[in-house]
C-alpha cells in the first residue's frame, strides 16, 4: 500500500486506568497529514466515536480505561500529500497495584517509572501524564508507600513533586495520582515510580547540548522542501527555549508573510535522567536568497547553525 | 509550599533605580526552573518582567530590557530586580514567582513600589 | 508578542450560576494556556496550567477546555469565595504575555 513502517518503542501499561497515546512522528506531522488509528493490522479504523471506551482523539488514541485485553499492535497511518507512513505501537497491558510490597517483576519497566533522586540536594520527580486535550486532569496528589505525601520538605509544583534536602530515606516505591474526566465520566489515574538515590551530579550540567547541528552546510537543489532537526539534550523539564532563528529573529516572525519558512513543533523523549528535545525547521521551498544565511537553532545559552549552499555541479550530466 | 519574600524600599524617585530582592525557602534557585519578576500597576493586568533561570541566564520582556537586569545570590537563595530610570508608570505591585515547565505556579505576596518626587 | 484577549472583562452572577470566561491568542500557543485567580490586595494564584490540568487544591467546578488559540474557563456552580479577577497568560512564547483579567462578581 506504499506505506513506510516504523517500529516503535514498547509501552507497557497498567490495566484498569486510562491511557493515551499520541501518533506524532516529527518532520511527519507537523504539515498538513490525517492520522488514522488501526488495531493489529485491522482493516477497521479505531471508532471516533468518544463515547466508545477506546477511540480516536485526533492524533491520539484513548483508552478509558485500559484492559488486559487490550495488548497488542496498534498502527497509526499519517497520510500525507505525497507521503504515507505506518507507526506501530506494541501495548502490553499489566494487572499491577502499586502498593504491592515491591515493585520487581516488572518486566522492562520504561524510564517514566524509574526516577532518581540526588543526595542532599533539592531534586524534584516527575508525573507523567500524556493525554489529549479533551481529558480534564484533577490536581496531583503524591504518595510514598502508600501514604499521602506531606511535610515542608515536599511541594508540588504543576506534575512535579519538588524533594528538598533529600535524604536516603527518600528512597522508595512513590505513586502520583490524578482524576481524569472525560465527557463528564470520572477515571483514575495512578503512575507508580520507583525511586533510588545518588551521590553523583546530575546528567551533563546546566547547559544544553545541540547534537545536530554541528555548525556546518548542507547541500540542497534550488526550490526543493527541505526539512531540519534540531535535537538538543537538557536537564528534565528545564526552562530553556528551543527555537529556530534567522539574522537574529525568530523564523516564524522573520517569514510571518510568505511562511515560506516555518519552525516546527517541539515533541521530546524522556530519559533517566534528561530529554532529548527535537524541533525542526521547513523549507517549503529553498530560495537563491536562502543560501549562505545561518539558520541558528538555539537551546537556553547554546546555539548551533545550518547554512544552505548550492551543490557542485555535476559535469557527468553533460 | 515554596515561600518567597520580596524586599526593598517602597519609594523611589523618578529616575533612578528600583531594586527589590526576592527571598526564596524551601526550595534553592540553582536546581531547577526559572525565577522571575511580574508586576502589576494599580488597578490594572499583570505585566512579565523577565526570569533568571536555575543556570544563571536571564530574559527580559523586550518591553522594559534596555532597564532591567536580574541577578542572584546563591548563598543567599536570593534573585534580584534592578529597574532603571523609573518614571510614574513603574509604579505597581511587584510579584516575585517560579515558572515551572508550564505557568507561573507559587508567587510571592507582592511589595508596592511607588515612584514619586 | 502574543496578545491575549479575555472576555467579558466583567460579569455579574448569581449563586449557583455557571460562569464561562474565554480567553483567544493572537498566535498559536500549543495548550500552554495557563488560569489564575486574585482577589483584592493579594497575588494571584494558579488554577489551570497546560489548557487542561488543575493545579493542587483547585475544587473540581473549575473546568478548562480549548485548543490552537480560543480557550475557555468555566466555573459550574459559582461560589461566594470565587469573587476575584481571573486572568489568563500564554506560556508558549517570549515574552509571556497575560490577557487583561475578567472581574466577577455576585449580584
Known amino acids: 500500500d506504499g506505506c513506510k513502517d516504523i517500529f516503535m518503542k514498547n509501552e507497557i501499561l497498567s490495566a484498569s486506568q486510562p491511557f493515551a497515546f499520541n501518533c506524532t512522528f516529527p518532520p511527519i506531522t507537523s504539515g498538513e497529514v490525517s492520522v488514522t488509528w488501526y488495531k493489529n493490522s485491522s482493516k477497521i479504523p479505531v471508532s471516533k466515536i468518544i463515547q466508545s471506551r477506546i477511540h480516536q482523539d485526533e492524533t491520539w488514541i484513548l483508552f478509558l480505561p485500559m484492559e488486559w485485553g487490550d495488548s497488542g499492535v496498534y498502527q497509526c497511518v499519517i497520510k500525507g500529500r505525497d507521503s504515507c507512513h505506518r507507526i506501530h505501537v506494541n501495548l502490553t497491558v499489566f494487572e499491577k497495584h502499586w502498593c504491592d510490597t515491591s515493585i520487581g517483576g516488572l518486566p522492562n519497566l520504561s524510564d517514566e517509572y524509574k526516577q532518581i533522586l540526588h543526595l542532599g540536594k533539592d531534586d524534584s520527580l516527575t508525573c507523567h501524564l500524556h493525554f489529549p486535550k479533551s481529558c480534564v486532569l484533577g490536581p496531583i496528589k503524591w504518595y510514598k508507600d502508600c501514604n499521602e505525601i506531606k511535610g515542608e520538605r515536599f511541594t508540588v509544583l504543576e506534575t512535579r513533586l519538588l524533594v528538598s534536602n533529600v535524604s536516603a530515606e527518600d528512597r522508595g516505591n512513590y505513586a502520583c495520582q490524578a482524576i481524569l474526566t472525560h465527557s463528564g465520566k470520572q477515571y483514575e489515574v495512578l503512575n507508580g515510580i520507583t525511586v533510588s538515590i545518588t551521590e553523583r551530579a546530575g546528567y551533563g550540567g546546566s547547559v544544553p547540548k545541540i547534537i545536530y547541528p554541528k555548525n556546518h552546510s548542507i547541500e540542497v537543489q534550488l526550490g526543493t522542501t527541505l526539512i531540519v532537526d534540531c535535537n538538543v539534550t537538557d536537564t528534565k523539564d528545564n526552562t530553556n527555549l528551543r527555537c529556530w532563528r534567522v539574522n537574529n529573529t525568530l523564523v516564524d516572525d522573520y517569514y510571518d508573510e510568505s511562511k515560506r519558512i516555518r519552525e516546527g513543533v517541539e515533541t521530546h523523549v524522556s530519559f533517566r535522567e534528561h530529554n532529548l528535545y527535537t524541533v525542526n525547521i521547513t523549507f517549503l521551498e529553498v530560495k537563491m536568497e536562502d543560501y549562505g544565511l545561518p539558520f541558528m537553532c538555539h537551546a537556553g545559552v547554546s546555539t548551533a547553525y545550518i547554512i544552505l549552499q548550492l551543490p557542485a555541479p555535476d559535469f557527468r550530466a553533460y | 509550599d515554596l515561600q518567597f519574600q520580596e524586599s526593598g524600599p517602597g519609594l523611589v524617585k523618578p529616575s533612578q533605580t528600583l531594586s527589590l530582592t526576592c527571598t526564596v525557602s524551601?526550595?534553592?534557585?540553582?536546581?531547577?526552573?526559572?525565577w522571575n519578576w511580574i508586576r502589576q500597576p494599580p488597578g490594572k493586568g499583570l505585566e512579565w518582567i523577565g526570569y533568571?533561570?536555575?543556570?544563571?541566564?536571564?530574559n527580559y520582556n523586550p518591553s522594559l530590557k534596555s532597564r532591567v537586569t536580574i541577578t542572584r545570590d546563591t548563598s543567599k537563595n536570593q534573585f534580584s530586580l534592578k529597574l532603571s530610570s523609573v518614571t510614574a508608570a513603574d509604579t505597581a505591585v511587584y510579584f516575585c514567582?517560579?515558572?515551572?515547565?508550564?505557568?507561573?505556579?507559587?508567587w510571592g505576596q507582592g511589595t508596592l513600589v511607588t515612584v514619586s518626587s | 508578542d502574543i496578545q491575549m484577549t479575555q472576555s467579558p472583562s466583567s460579569l455579574s452572577a448569581s449563586v449557583g450560576d455557571r460562569v464561562t470566561i474565554t480567553c483567544r491568542a493572537s498566535?498559536?500557543?500549543?495548550?500552554?494556556l495557563n488560569w489564575y485567580q486574585q482577589k483584592p490586595g493579594k497575588a494571584p494564584k494558579l488554577l489551570i496550567y497546560?489548557?487542561?490540568m488543575l493545579h493542587s487544591g483547585v475544587p473540581s467546578r473549575f473546568s478548562p477546555s480549548g485548543s490552537g488559540n480560543d480557550y475557555t474557563f468555566t466555573i459550574s456552580s459559582l461560589q461566594p469565595e470565587d469573587i476575584a479577577t481571573y486572568y489568563c497568560?500564554?506560556?508558549?512564547?517570549?515574552?509571556?504575555?497575560f490577557g487583561g483579567g475578567t472581574k466577577v462578581e455576585i449580584k
Open positions: 514567582a517560579i515558572r515551572g515547565p508550564y505557568s507561573f505556579t507559587y
Open positions: 524551601r526550595y534553592s534557585i540553582t536546581a531547577d526552573f526559572a
Open positions: 533568571i533561570s536555575y543556570s544563571g541566564d536571564t
Open positions: 498566535q498559536w500557543i500549543n495548550n500552554y
Open positions: 497546560y489548557t487542561s
Open positions: 497568560q500564554q506560556g508558549h512564547t517570549l515574552p509571556w504575555t
